[in-house]
Structure formats: C-alpha cells, structure tokens
C-alpha cells in the first residue's frame, strides 16, 4: 500500500483466486483515543472500533471511504484504491491499446518542435467516475521538471472498431528545454488514471526528437508557368517550426492528387520551398513537411486545388506568413566552402544513417549488463557546447571540436568489432559508406597534420553475436541524433557564417593551434 | 434493519435446474457482495461462490464451476443462484448471505431454501 | 483449497462451564478467520470476525484468538441459548473454506 496523495491510498493486489487479499491498517488521525468508531463509504455501519482498523483488501468492495467518527464527528478519511496485478501484469483496463506498433501504446505524444513543449493524449471508453493526472520529467534519476497542463477532454471523438471512444490530451512543457542539444536522457510522461476505485498509471518514454511532426505547410499557393502544363508551388515553413529555419530545417515532399482523392505514386521530395509540378483541372495538390535530418513523423499534408485559385491547408497547419528564412538558397553568397562542404557531408550521414538502421516506431531496445559503457559514454553535442545559432555565431570553434570527438568517436565504433565482427556486414552496404563518410567529415574538420586529442575511446565489444546486433542498432540509433545535430550546425554555418566573420572552417584550421589545446583541457564536459 | 429474505422450497427432477433467489432490504444492496452456502441434510456448510451486485463480478468455488450461475438483478435488489443439471447429491438447504466489506466473511445470512432432488 | 479441521467434532458440556473450540488451517490465513453459530433449522449467526473481533449485538462471552493456522473459539461461562454447532471459516484465499462443525451439547 502506499499514498497516492493526501488521505488516498493505493492497494495493490494480485488478482488470481489463490491470492490472499492484502491486509491494511487504516489509522484514525486525531489526539482523540476513546469512543471511535469506523464506518465506509458501502456502509453507515459500524465497522470497528477503536484508533485503527484491519480490513481486508480482496475485491472492489473493500475499497473505498473509510470514515473514522467520535459522537457524530467525522475525525479523519483514508480512500482506498485497488490496483491490480493479474499473473504479474498490472491491469491496464481504463485505457484503449493504440495499435500501431509491436509495444503496447496507450499514451501518444507528439511535439510540432524542439522547445521541449509537447502534446499527449490517449483514448477510453469510459465516461463517468474517471480522474486523470500527469507528472512528467527528463530522466527519473535526478529528474529534470517538465511541467504539464491540465488534462482535457477533447471535442474529438475517435472510432475504432465501431466502438466510440473520449480522447483526453495533455499539454507539457519542459522547464529548461535546449533545442540545439542532442538527447541523451528521455521523457518519462507518467499518466495515473482513477475509475471509481480502480487505479492504473500508464507511461511513456521519448526524446523529443522522436515524437518530432510539424504542422503542415503553409501558404500553399500555386503559379501557372507560361507555355506549360506545368504549375510553380510554393509554401512556407508552418508558424509552429523551430526557428531559425537554416538551422532547423525541413524537407517537403509534393504529390499529385487526381480525382476522388486517388493518389498518384510519384512523390517529389525538395529541400526548398517551392517546386514545379503537373497540375490537371481536376487534381489537387498537396505537400506535407518533415525534419530534414531526422526521421520522424511527416505532417499532415496541406493541399491546394488546381482548378481554384489561391491556397489551402490541411490538418492542424495554421496560417499566417511566417517561413521567415525558409527560402534560403541552396549554396548562400560568400560562405566558406569548408561549411558548404560540411553541409553536404554531413546531410549524406543523416541518408546513410537512417538507411543503416531505419525508423521502427518508437522501440525501447532492451539494457544489457556492459552495454552503457560503450553507449552511455557517447561524447553528446550539449547545451553548453555552442552548437546552437547563437553559440556558432559566438564562436563555433567550441561546437565544431565536440563534433570532431563525436565523429572520431564513432569513426572508430564502426570499424571495430562490433561491426567487424558476426553477423557480418556488406564492406559497400550502408554501414560501410557511413564509416567512409564519417571520415570524410573528420578529415574536413581536422586535416592531415592536426591531430586533436579525444577524451573518449570505445569499449570492448560483447561477444555474442546477438549482444552485438543490439549494440549495432543502439550505436546507429545514438549516430542518428547526433549527425542530425551536426547537419543542422554545417547547414547553418553554410547558411550564415562569412569568411569574414571570422567564424569560417577555413579561419578555425589557421587559429593557433595551442589555443585548441587549452580549450581542450579547460573546457571539459560531463556526459550523462 | 438488514434481511435477505429468500424464494420457498422447491422440489425438481434430476437433470433439471434451479433458480433460487435472495431479496436484499434495510442496507444499500449495491455496494455489498452477496454469497451462496449450501448445506446438505445433517452436513456442515459448502461455500459456492460470491458476487458483487454493482459490476457482476463472480467468484466461484471450483467444484461449483460450471453447474453454479449467479446473477442479480439491481433494480429489484435481488440475487439469483441457479444450479443446473441437479442429481441426488444436490439435495440441500441454499442460504444467500451478504459479504462484509473490508472483510470476507458474512455478516447477514437468509433464511435458507430447500432443494429437494426427486424422480 | 484450504482445509480447516475442527476439533473436537461434539462435545458435551454444563451450563456455567468454560467451553474452548479449536480450528486449524492447512496453510496459514493470517487473521482471517470467523466463527459462526448455527442452531437446528436456523441460519448461521456471525460471532466473531478476524480471528477475535466481537460481531456487533454478540455477548462478550464469546472470544476469539489465534493467527497462522491456529484458532480457538472460546465460550467463558456456557448459557442455556449457547447449545448449537460452531463452524470457523476462512476467508483469505478463495474459495473461503468452512470447517466440519462442532457440535456443542447439554451434559
């Protein structure tokens, strides 16, 4: 038993016919000592006498209020809730399962950006006796505050299986939030749900980066080309992306809709914010957005008609102009070429990366005695590393060596033999072109004849083949987010950073190089 | 004052069922769990089973399983045990009795109704 | 199941005399043990619940102890109305097992 809030406790039982119930001694709180009598929410009844009571917990009817009484006076309650365990699984019936992965789900999160405020809901069939609260951290050791809303029930009625069920949502917000920072702890969101007497809690863990999808594009807006069958669409950046936009950037992906909403297959996918296309009468046009350097979800589409004039939009997208540097070109006036060609560098990894080891849906891979070692000590780009906008323009010198550690760092775990070894991997397949890219990118960042000291070296790899296949999937999955880190950083300083700034690669590799020895050894960090 | 006052004796042939039935009064019948106890002639008490009257929720002894149906009806404040294919052995006094809460044993008993089994 | 043994099955005793009913468990039920009185062509009456708590409107006689597996039911001082069966039952695993009863006579 244990203390949900003030005067509301929790019993947990294991509901099988061969389990005892659970003995519980409530206590009546007050100075008082004779005449107390005890009665329960079941019952005017008395049900005992004296400071405690022992009941037995064994079914729902043993729950509930009980009141502790001296002449007519209520002195004190205790409520008690049942949470049950049936062969070891603690029930999860006040929520319905969404089915859309191998895990079971009833809490879906999702974020339109990285300033760590983010949206949950879940679904029930129940309407009447049902409480709700949220409590949210990053990380349950030394949790970090996120702080979430109140829970709302939604207009929104969702179908499934010819079953109506509520949708309730919550909205969280994470108190320091560091968009620019690579995650290395996660979201914990814990959901406790009351009905009548039953007590549930539901949870999900997340980075944010994971539960990533943008509102769709705005402004979709079509021009006719003259002499041609073809259109010019254009769209802007949603208002609710993170800005800036040459930092954290998207890609879009247009598709022709014919008559009655049919599809048509062929999906053009840009970078920029405008493409040519075929637009019959009759079809519609739609475009929908993702991060540019990090798999998760699509937006909803926005769509404009090709017979009408002017724009539309789908979804959730909100208007407005917005966008503002969107439209940046591909390879800006005066940018050093060391940036452009980290840029491209750099969006190669996050292809190769994400080809090596494809979204799954949010997997949790299960911990390995010994694996932290290897994963855990992972040198993350971090809120103080200066690889955010304003950190770069300061001085990137900081935020380009924690990338040079990271790309020695995992230089070195893709050819060692975790990834040598069994089961093995094709020397041209994905892995093999992301070992020989991330080279190409170390190289960029430290020519022949600069060698920069790193703190970290990888582990030993485990010895069975299978420890190694999940130590693969855990190495590509933390390659991920720290090469969508990086690619943000190069397209930004391609986007931004002159060679007059001072700020250029080209500039930082004729800096003094005892200057980056002392920032090496006065500007450590700490890793989680 | 709390009483569960039970349906009369009923005689039946073998093979056929029973349905006795057990009317709560002076106690808010919903929130307590209702039990059968069978007693065959000059024998001690057998417990078959509880209900709760709110959600249906039944637990029965594994001897009764599958012979013993409990049922309530909340709007006339009344439990039923129906026992199928009744022989010999079923020939008994069935008393309905109410679950104490925070407890599980029972506090308020019927009067008892007769089964008698007979060709 | 629970098996719960009463002993003894029958005992004749006076009225005035200190009568002592003993039930054990087959395995241990914690507190959770009551006793129940049954006279001929009655329904059983609750005496004590929890192995030793006094059922509302029962003489203070009537007291019950023990925990585990071991319980006694005891009668301080027999009076004429006492003479029936006594039945322990526990009710701490289902199914919620009765003892085999003990009959109580006039000496």
């Known amino acids: 038993i244990w203390e949900l809030e003030k005067d509301v406790y929790v019993v947990e039982l294991d509901w099988h016919p061969d389990a005892p119930g659970e003995m519980v001694v409530l206590t009546c709180h007050t100075p008082e000592e004779d005449d107390i009598t005890w009665t329960s929410a079941q019952s005017s009844e008395v049900l005992g006498s004296g400071k405690t009571l022992t009941i037995q917990v064994k079914e729902f009817g043993d729950a509930g209020q009980y009141t502790c009484h001296k002449g007519g006076k209520v002195l004190s309650r205790s409520l008690l809730l049942i949470h049950k365990k049936e062969d070891g699984i603690w029930s999860t019936d006040i929520l319905k399962e969404q089915k859309e992965s191998k895990n079971k789900i009833f809490l879906k999160c999702e974020a339109k950006n990285y300033s760590g405020r983010f949206t949950c809901w879940w679904l029930t069939a129940i309407s009447t006796d049902l409480k709700f609260s949220v409590k949210s951290s990053r990380g349950f050791s030394d949790p970090q505050g996120v702080t979430c809303g109140a829970v709302t029930l939604s207009a929104e009625r969702v179908r499934v299986d010819n079953r109506d069920y509520k949708k309730y949502t919550v909205e969280c917000q994470e108190g320091s939030a560091c968009p620019s920072a690579e995650e290395s702890l996660p979201i914990e969101v814990v959901v406790d749900a009351i009905h009548k007497l039953k007590y549930e809690n539901y949870t999900s863990s997340f980075f944010i980066r994971d539960i990533i999808k943008p509102d769709p594009p705005t402004n979709l807006q079509l021009k006719p080309l003259k002499n041609s069958r073809h259109v010019e669409v254009s769209w802007e950046y949603p208002d609710t992306w993170s800005t800036p936009h040459s930092y954290f950037s998207l890609t879009f992906c247009i598709q022709a809709q014919g008559k009655n909403n049919r599809e048509k297959k062929d999906r053009l996918c840009v970078d920029k914010t405008s493409a040519k296309v075929v637009c019959h009468k009759d079809a519609k046009i739609r475009v929908q957005a993702r991060d540019r350097y990090y798999s998760s979800s699509w937006s909803d589409w926005a769509s404009v008609s090709c017979s009408g004039s002017g724009s539309s939009r789908g979804g959730s997208g909100s208007g407005g102009s917005g966008g503002g540097g969107s439209k940046l070109r591909a390879v800006p006036e005066g940018s050093s070429p060391a940036w452009i060609q980290g840029q491209q560098l750099s969006q190669k990894l996050c292809t190769l990366v994400w080809s090596a080891h494809p979204p799954m849906g949010h997997v949790d891979l299960p911990r390995e005695e010994g694996d932290g070692e290897t994963t855990s000590d992972v040198p993350r780009i971090q809120c103080g590393d200066g690889c955010d906008p304003q950190g770069l323009k300061d001085n990137s010198q900081f935020c380009l060596q924690r990338i040079h550690q990271g790309l020695v760092f995992y230089e070195k775990l893709l050819g060692s033999d975790i990834f040598t070894g069994e089961p093995s991997l094709l020397p041209d397949g994905p892995v093999g072109q992301l070992h020989a890219n991330l080279l190409g990118l170390r190289q960029l960042l430290q020519p022949e004849g600069h060698h920069w000291e790193t703190e970290q070296t990888p582990s030993p790899s485990p010895s069975q083949p299978w420890q190694r296949l999940l130590l693969r999937l855990k190495i590509l999955r933390s390659l991920q987010a720290f090469v969508a880190v990086a690619a943000r950083v190069f397209a930004h300083g391609a986007a931004t950073l002159s060679p007059g700034s001072g700020s250029g690669l080209n500039d930082i590799f004729e800096a003094q190089k005892i200057e980056w020895h002392e920032h090496h050894h006065h500007h450590h960090h700490h890793h989680h | 004052e709390v009483q569960l006052v039970q349906s009369g004796a009923e005689v039946k042939k073998p093979g056929a069922s029973v349905k006795v039935s057990c009317k709560g009064s002076?106690?808010?019948?919903?929130?307590?769990?209702l039990g059968w106890v069978r007693q065959a002639p000059g024998a001690g008490l057998d417990w078959m089973g509880i209900?709760?009257?709110?959600?249906?929720?039944?637990r029965y002894a594994g001897k009764f399983q599958g012979q013993v149906t409990m049922s309530v009806d909340t709007s006339t404040s009344t439990a039923y045990m129906e026992l199928s294919s009744l022989r010999a052995g079923d020939i008994a006094v069935y008393y309905c009795?109410?679950?104490?809460?925070?407890?599980?044993?029972?506090?308020?008993w019927g009067q008892g109704t007769l089964v008698t089994v007979s060709s | 199941d629970i098996q719960m043994t009463q002993s003894p099955s029958s005992l004749s005793a006076s009225v005035g005399d200190r009568v002592t009913i003993t039930c054990r468990a087959s395995?241990?039920?914690?507190?959770?043990l009551a006793w129940y009185q049954q006279k001929p062509e009655k329904a059983p009456k609750s005496l004590i619940y929890?192995?030793?708590s006094l059922q509302s409107g029962v003489p203070s006689r009537f007291s019950g102890s023990g925990s585990g597996t071991d319980f006694t039911l005891t009668i301080s001082s027999l009076q004429p109305e006492d003479f029936a069966t006594y039945y322990c039952q526990q009710y701490n695993i289902y199914p919620y097992t009765f003892g085999q009863g003990t009959k109580l006579e006039i000496k």
């Open positions: 209900m709760s009257p709110v959600d249906s929720d039944i």
């Open positions: 395995q241990g039920i914690s507190s959770w």
């Open positions: 009795a109410r679950r104490r809460p925070g407890q599980g044993y029972f506090d308020f």
């Open positions: 929890a192995a030793s």
């Open positions: 002076g106690y808010s019948f919903t929130t307590y769990w």
